[in-house]
């Protein structure tokens, strides 16, 4: 139903959904701190622009008795319950921040007339792609897929001279919310990734994964998985691995690889880690001091959501335009705004663009080194280390199929 918005006459409110089910197990207090820090910045920016208005946030908490699992996979109704609460209280702001769970966002988007923008720190799944009033501030699965397909096809780098067209995907169902949807997208038979690959098999059991590592009859040398190094170690341990196996470890929201004193454990030598380029100033910021490297991105997305709203509010107010219109609701895309840690770019569909970084373990230094970066906005690869000290033969990534011989140009569709 149509709810009146607290969004006019110089007073602008942000509705922040504080849900029990969340993409990351982050104390709600930390998210509140991030939002409040964002509000301070927005107020300052509006004041500097000569706009004398009030911006506040209302935190909407769901019923902890009903929705207390903390697990996104049981989140479908929580968002709708919160919207009902908002509706009953007649307390809708100009913009909705949250939810972060894909199920929840999808259901809310499906069951409501969204005449206001929704900003999500999460909603990673393909089912949340191409939603006209949804903005996602953490890399969605579609962005990961485009990188992987691009990298698979690459065969003109001195360290990657074979196009790949095959892969195993390890997915055992215990993944974190981001990983669950990333792997779900790779598994989906109708996805871009599946369409572009000639062979793809999902490994669901630990033993299946472990057997592949030395199986002479394996159909691919490449295994994609999602999680941190510890997750890989629990699965792989110190087992022997065939020399032409490449494990791609997707670990986007983890800054630990870039810390100075980090040494790569030996079990990471056959692994390429895909992560995001780390922020500069986050380490010393007040809201992130208590956060682990993995959680920073989540809280930062909430903060940036506030800054995005401030950016759009400023533009509309300066142009004398109404905030409670479909135009405003549809405007949170195809733009760059000043985020907490530098410029943040949103694509035509309101999804955040970022620089993905592919790391390898140097056999010389036992350090993680940058192999290449990938700009999701322009789908472009930027090689960094042209002569990597790989564990693989001739410092080149192997062919994806053993014994395919000197054929460099294979393309299977």
């Amino acid at each position: 139903s149509q709810v009146s918005q607290n969004c006019h006459n110089g007073s602008y409110e942000i509705s922040v959904l504080m849900m029990g089910n969340s993409a990351f197990a982050e104390p709600l207090k930390n998210l509140e701190d991030a939002v409040n820090e964002g509000l301070e910045i927005v107020r300052g920016r509006l004041q500097n622009a000569g706009l004398n208005v009030t911006v506040n946030a209302t935190f909407m908490y769901s019923d902890g008795l009903i929705h207390n699992s903390g697990d996104c996979r049981s989140s479908t109704c929580e968002g709708l319950d919160l919207l009902r609460k908002i509706s009953n209280a007649q307390r809708m702001g100009c913009v909705l921040i949250g939810p972060s769970c894909t199920y929840s966002t999808f259901q809310m988007y499906l069951d409501t007339e969204l005449s206001y923008p929704m900003i999500s720190a999460g909603s990673f799944g393909l089912s949340c792609d191409y939603k006209e009033t949804l903005t996602r501030l953490m890399s969605p699965a579609r962005k990961l897929m485009y990188f992987l397909v691009n990298f698979w096809k690459t065969n003109d780098l001195p360290f990657k001279t074979y196009s790949w067209s095959t892969s195993y995907v390890y997915k055992n169902g215990t993944e974190t919310e981001d990983c669950f949807w990333y792997l779900n997208a790779l598994e989906a038979s109708v996805s871009y990734f599946s369409h572009e690959l000639g062979f793809k098999v999902v490994l669901r059991q630990d033993k299946e994964f472990q057997d592949i590592l030395m199986d002479h009859n394996r159909k691919s040398n490449v295994i994609i998985m999602c999680g941190g190094p510890e997750f890989l170690y629990k699965l792989k341990g110190d087992r022997a691995v065939a020399e032409d196996i490449v494990i791609i470890l997707v670990d986007l929201f983890n800054d630990q690889y870039f810390e100075d004193n980090v040494t790569a454990p030996d079990y990471m030598k056959n692994v390429l880690v895909l992560t995001l380029s780390p922020g500069n100033s986050l380490l010393n910021s007040s809201f992130s001091r208590n956060l682990s490297p993995t959680k920073r991105d989540f809280a930062l997305a909430y903060l940036n959501g506030i800054l995005l709203f401030g950016h759009m509010l400023k533009i509309f107010l300066e142009n004398g335009e109404n905030i409670t219109t479909p135009k405003f609701a549809h405007a949170f895309r195809n733009l760059t705004f000043e985020g907490y840690d530098g410029p943040v770019t949103l694509d035509d569909w309101g999804d955040v663009d970022s620089t993905m970084v592919l790391l390898y373990t140097s056999v010389d230094t036992k350090k993680y080194k940058v192999l290449l970066t990938y700009d999701t906005h322009v789908n472009k690869t930027y090689p960094v280390d042209m002569s990597p000290t790989f564990t693989w033969k001739n410092s080149k990534l192997p062919n994806d199929i053993t014994g395919r011989g000197p054929q460099h140009h294979h393309h299977h569709h």
């Epitope: 065969n155 001195p158 090689p383 042209m386």
Partner: antibody, heavy 118, light 106 residues
């Protein structure tokens, strides 16, 4: 418009060192690798090394590992190559060349002539 | 390292004629890159990834080939095409260049 402007010609005595600069403009310096290429009189072009300005990663051609040292100043959008222990066979034109993968060496500097003579 | 051998070393051609320059690699590569250099100028990127013309390169130029044998072709030579053309590979490290082919206007 992308431009790579190199420092002027140098004449050096054997045993000396020389530092050649390459100032980039018209693009984001840290987004593209910078290569150095040698062209000695009557010889083919020889690739010496490459640097990624953002991460500071440097790869040398083994042949020039003890001869060349590549550095950069990102605040000045400038790459440098220092040649040490100069000998007569180091007499050449040295070029910096940007990568715009997949088009390697897409823009070149105008070249710096280094003459080594006693 | 991969050695690239260009032929011919020198070619004197009448305007309007077709020019073919070949580059042979000592081992198989996926792609070849070509550069044009005029006297007292720096090299210019001319063809990348075997057959893609760099920005501003006239369509009379084309590139082809695979494996160890690659070709740069000028369909109808013009006076401004007089230059030395170098092939280059980046399949193996380090990248290497051919010895060059000098094209002169007859």
């Amino acid at each position: 418009e992308v431009q790579l402007v190199q420092s002027g010609a140098e004449v050096k005595k054997p045993g000396a060192s020389v530092k050649v600069s390459c100032k980039a403009s018209g693009y984001t310096f840290t987004d593209h690798n910078m290569n150095w290429v040698k062209q000695a009189p009557g010889q083919r072009l020889e690739w010496m090394g490459v640097m990624n300005p953002k991460f500071g990663t440097i790869n040398y051609n083994q042949k020039f590992k003890d001869k060349a040292t590549i550095t950069r100043d990102t605040s000045a959008s400038t790459a440098y190559m220092e040649l040490s222990s100069l000998r007569s066979e180091d007499t050449a034109v040295y070029y910096c060349a940007r990568d715009d993968y997949p088009n390697y060496f897409d823009y070149w500097g105008q070249g710096t002539t280094v003459t080594v003579s006693s | 390292e991969i050695v690239l051998t260009q032929s011919p070393d020198f070619q004197s051609v009448t305007p309007g004629e077709k020019v073919t320059i070949t580059c042979s690699a000592s081992s198989s590569v996926n792609y070849m890159y070509w550069y044009q250099q005029k006297p007292d100028q720096s090299p210019k990127s001319w063809i990348y990834r075997t057959s893609n013309l760099a920005s501003g390169v006239p369509s009379r130029f084309s590139g082809s080939g695979s494996g160890t044998d690659f070709t740069l072709t000028i369909s109808s030579l013009e006076a401004e095409d007089a230059a030395t053309y170098y092939c280059q590979q980046y399949h193996d490290y380090p990248p290497t260049f051919g010895g060059g082919t000098k094209v002169e206007i007859k």
